[in-house]
């Protein structure tokens, strides 16, 4: 008989599950790249933009060699949940300018939610703990100005792009170690 109802099902092939997560991550990366380009085209960015509430990049070239699957999946999920919150905030608070990108931002949010569900499923199949974020969630304050919300949008899309780029690399590397 199989495992009792309600217990996480251990996947017969975690590599296939990882493949599926990589595909979704790549797809979201393409969407983010396209939307970031649209943003730059519609609302040219003057220099680099940062936002204190965004997560710091979890991976770098130096850390790729020491990656472990539980840590990568947990951190990726926490970071993507933060980006999801930021995208939701942009859609509600970003002002009329960002409403012109509403279909794309809505689609990006839906894809992000789908990837998060897939990562959650992958973690439960690998019997990994569903870790909560270390830090308490800080409420996102109102943008100081319309210009400020456009700068925030550049920062959010830029940060999400980098996070997803490293996520694809990290997940592919981890797949070879499974």
């Amino acid at each position: 008989p199989g495992p009792p109802a309600g217990s996480p099902r251990v996947s017969s092939d975690p590599r296939a599950d990882l493949d599926s997560a990589v595909l979704l991550t790549r797809s979201l990366l393409a969407d983010t790249r396209q939307l970031a380009a649209q943003m730059r085209d519609k609302f040219p960015a003057d220099g680099d933009h940062s936002l204190d509430s965004l997560p710091t990049l979890a991976m770098s070239a130096g850390t790729l060699g020491s990656l472990q699957l539980p840590g990568v999946l947990t951190r990726l999920r926490v970071d993507l949940m933060s980006y999801l919150r930021h995208v939701q905030w942009l859609r509600r608070a970003g002002g009329p300018s960002l409403k012109t990108l509403e279909p794309e931002l809505g689609a990006l949010q839906a894809r992000l939610e789908r990837l998060l569900r897939r990562l959650q499923l992958l973690m439960s199949r690998l019997a990994l703990p569903q870790a909560a974020p270390d830090q308490p969630v800080i409420p996102l304050g109102p943008p100081a100005s319309a210009w400020g919300s456009i700068r925030a949008a550049h920062a959010i899309l830029g940060g999400l792009h980098l996070t997803l780029d490293w996520a694809v690399r990290g997940l592919l590397l981890l797949k070879t170690r499974l």
Epitope: R92, G95, P142, S145, A146, W147, S149
Partner: antibody, heavy 117, light 111 residues
Amino acid sequence: QVQLVESGGGVVQPGRSLRLSCAASGFTFSHYDMHWVRQAPGKGLEWVAVISYHGSVKFYADSVKGRFTISRDNSKNTLYLQMNSLRAEDTAVYYCARTPGFHFDYWGQGTLVTVSS
Amino acid sequence: QSVLTQPPSASGTPGQRVTISCSGSSSNIGSNYVSWYQQLPGTAPKLLIYYDDLRPSGVPDRFSGSKSGTSASLAISGLRSEDEADYYCSAWDDSLSGVVFGGGTKLTVLG
């Protein structure tokens, strides 16, 4: 301190045109989206139009679409509302308002437009 | 006919708590932030509440906002005679691509 001062209101005949101005001071005008909101005598508030901080994104209420044009000159810290084909129902006090997102944090004192033959 | 629905009038005695409701739909209140404005007779509107429940500096904490689903409400506690004014709710509407207002509620402070 933030100040918004509307001008250009007056009495005008139906079918004619009028241009309202809103002079802004006390803040970085080019960083904020700006709106026009109107209020007919004894009635509630009605949103008219918005223009983005850079001037390229504009939205209008259905009641004024095709007749009114919102514009801005960031070098002059001024917002405009060009009103063509005016109707009696356009009679109202017109307010300009600053917005950081979707709420109006500062309003002008308003300028009265009366459309009457 | 306003897109957001408010009661035309409300009243209370000094010291009382009064609540004004604002009902909308999924395309406005349901998916965007609500703001509230106070308009004293013969003056321009003034921002009271934004981001559903935040108060700008200078607005007394007797004023509070809340939202649930497609409805929002403004509560005024410790009612004072100077609160007698018109109150408007507002939100962006994704279907109309514009800002929508409630019809306004005239608050009368009795006695």
